[in-house]
């Protein structure tokens, strides 16, 4: 019973985690304009893995896709790859784990097969979670580096009379979604691996057979042996539009210039 619960919970946690990884990958708010200690601009910039957006105070939001592959920073490409690998592995892991669930009967599938599938999906979830965490962390590190570089520029590049509004970027919501989702997928994977141990059938316990030979009594007990580990990989991509930030009502994205009533 505890095994079934652990497996079921591991599956649900991983499912939520992978949904979160997909959401994070698609979100536009990986980096958002830093508003602290900055002049209050009437324009708010934010960027995702696939496009960058500008939201005006007026409510008008404009997003532009990154329509180049070669022109993008290698780090951004690496983050995209990690997130996609994470989603692909997670999706495969989910597929495998559905068939591995103890509560689902598929023909005459043996418990040992279910145990192997549970372990496989668990490992896939772990790797998927690690990929997401790595991707988000690489992006966060990139942001921190750029933030301090642009901060240095703000204070050294003020020689002229004309000032520029330096747009610095800080952590966006997608990073936190990604970290939490990656963590959940990782936890779900660990739970699946734990469940696998309980699912694996104990080897047949033959009764001990005593052989009497020349005064010695030796008892042979065939023992069971378990093992297995492995590693996998990750993702899939889909685009959603996340209009948001600040208060919902003042952040409306409208495509046309006028509103006809």
């Amino acid at each position: 019973m505890a095994v079934t619960a652990c497996q079921g919970l591991g599956f649900v946690v991983s499912l939520i985690g992978i949904a979160g990884i997909i959401a994070a990958t698609c979100m536009d708010q990986w980096s958002t304009q830093d508003l602290y200690n900055n002049p209050v601009t009437a324009v708010f910039n934010y960027q995702g893995l696939w496009r960058s957006c500008v939201r005006e105070s007026s409510g008008f939001t404009e997003c532009r896709g990154y329509f180049t592959l070669l022109g993008l920073p290698a780090m951004l490409q690496a983050v995209r790859a990690l997130m996609i690998v994470g989603i692909v592995l997670g999706a495969i892991g989910l597929l495998v784990s559905i068939f591995a669930l103890k509560c689902i009967r598929i023909g005459s599938m043996e418990d040992s097969a279910k145990a192997n599938m549970t372990l496989t999906s668990g490992i896939m979830f772990i790797v998927s979670g690690l990929c997401a965490i790595a991707g988000v962390s690489v992006f966060a590190n990139m942001l921190v580096t750029n933030f301090w570089m642009s901060t240095a520029n703000m204070y050294t590049g003020m020689g002229g009379m004309v000032q520029t509004v330096q747009t610095r970027y800080t952590f966006g919501a997608a990073l936190f979604v990604g970290w939490v989702a990656g963590g959940l997928t990782l936890i779900g994977g660990v739970m699946m691996c734990i469940a696998c141990r309980g699912l694996a059938p104990e080897e047949t316990n033959y009764k001990a057979v005593s052989y009497h030979a020349s005064g010695h009594s030796v008892a042979y007990k065939p023992g069971g042996f378990k093992a297995s580990t492995g590693f996998g990989s990750n993702t899939k991509n889909k685009k959603i539009y996340d209009g948001g930030a600040r208060t919902e009502d003042e952040v409306q994205s409208y495509p046309s210039k006028h509103d006809y009533v």
Epitope: Q33, P39, V40, T41, A42, V43, N45, Q47, S52, C53, V54, E56, S57, S58, G59, F60, E62, R64, V162, Q163, T164, V165, T167, T247, D249, E250, Q252, Y254, K257, H258, D259, V261
Partner: antibody
Framework: QVQLQQPGAELVKPGASVKLSCKAS????????IQWVKQRPGQGLEWIGM????????NYNEKFKKKAALTLDKSSSTAYMQLSSPTSEDSAVYYC???????????WGQGTSVTVSS | DIVMTQSPSSLTVTAGEKVTMSCKSS????????????LTWYQQKPGQPPKLLIY???TRESGVPDRFTGSGSGTDFTLTISSVQAEDLAVYYC?????????FGAGTKLELR
């Protein structure tokens, strides 16, 4: 069509606060910020602040924070600006304006001429 | 606050003439996110509220005659009227729409010779 209706004139005694109104119609009022602009006779334009009809969020020019208070009545789609302790310096035309694309002021009311005189 | 400096303060022209007026801001109005300049031009005729002419420094508002052209980027902007008509006589204001508080230039008055 988009309309921002303002009363033509207000005569105020020094020190007695005045509340100016601006009734918006002809568009989805809750989607656009309403701004207030001051213009003294023969002078330029000054941005006072703005209010969002949906959330009631406000953003003021620091210079007018103590002088002007922006409010609104959602049910009648009317924005208000209360001027506290008016002096002769506050005698001006006050416009209410809609904020449109590019954060530009795309539609203007006819303006309310405020005269502070005893 | 961003200071908007308009020049000249007044211009005397004859009908049909090409007119250019300048607006300079103390800070760049160019937003790196969309490469748009948040500068707006307005026209105000006597006894009327201002009227929007151009936003994003160069985008003409619908209904504005194409003799009005906005140009420039960063801190230096220009409004050009290719062939001045009698109805164009007014005060022209530029405005910073990028950083709060939103600020206006002192205006350029266009007069007929």
């Amino acid at each position: 069509q988009v309309q921002l209706q303002q009363p033509g004139a207000e005569l105020v005694k020094p020190g007695a606060s005045v509340k100016l109104s601006c009734k918006a119609s002809g568009y989805t009022v809750t989607r656009y910020w309403i701004q207030w602009v001051k213009q003294r006779p023969g002078q330029g334009l000054e941005w006072i602040g703005m209010i969002h009809p949906n959330s009631g969020s406000t953003n003021y020019n620091e210079k007018f924070k103590k002088k002007a208070a922006l409010t609104l009545d959602k049910s009648s789609s009317t924005a208000y600006m209360q001027l506290s302790s008016p002096t002769s310096e506050d005698s001006a035309v006050y416009y209410c304006v809609r904020m449109g694309l590019g954060n530009a002021m795309d539609f203007w009311g006819q303006g309310t001429s405020v005269t502070v005189s005893s | 606050d961003i200071v908007m400096t308009q020049s000249p303060s007044s211009l005397t022209v004859t009908a049909g003439e090409k007119v250019t007026m300048s607006c300079k801001s103390s800070q760049s109005l160019l937003n790196s996110g969309n490469q748009k300049n948040y500068l707006t031009w307005y026209q105000q005729k006597p006894g009327q509220p201002p009227k929007l002419l151009i936003y994003w420094a160069s985008t003409r508002e619908s209904g504005v005659p194409d003799r009005f052209t906005g140009s420039g980027s960063g801190t230096d902007f220009t409004l050009t009227i290719s062939s001045v008509q009698a109805e164009d006589l007014a005060v022209y204001y530029c405005q910073n729409n990028y950083v709060y508080p939103l600020t206006f230039g002192a205006g350029t008055k266009l007069e007929l010779r």
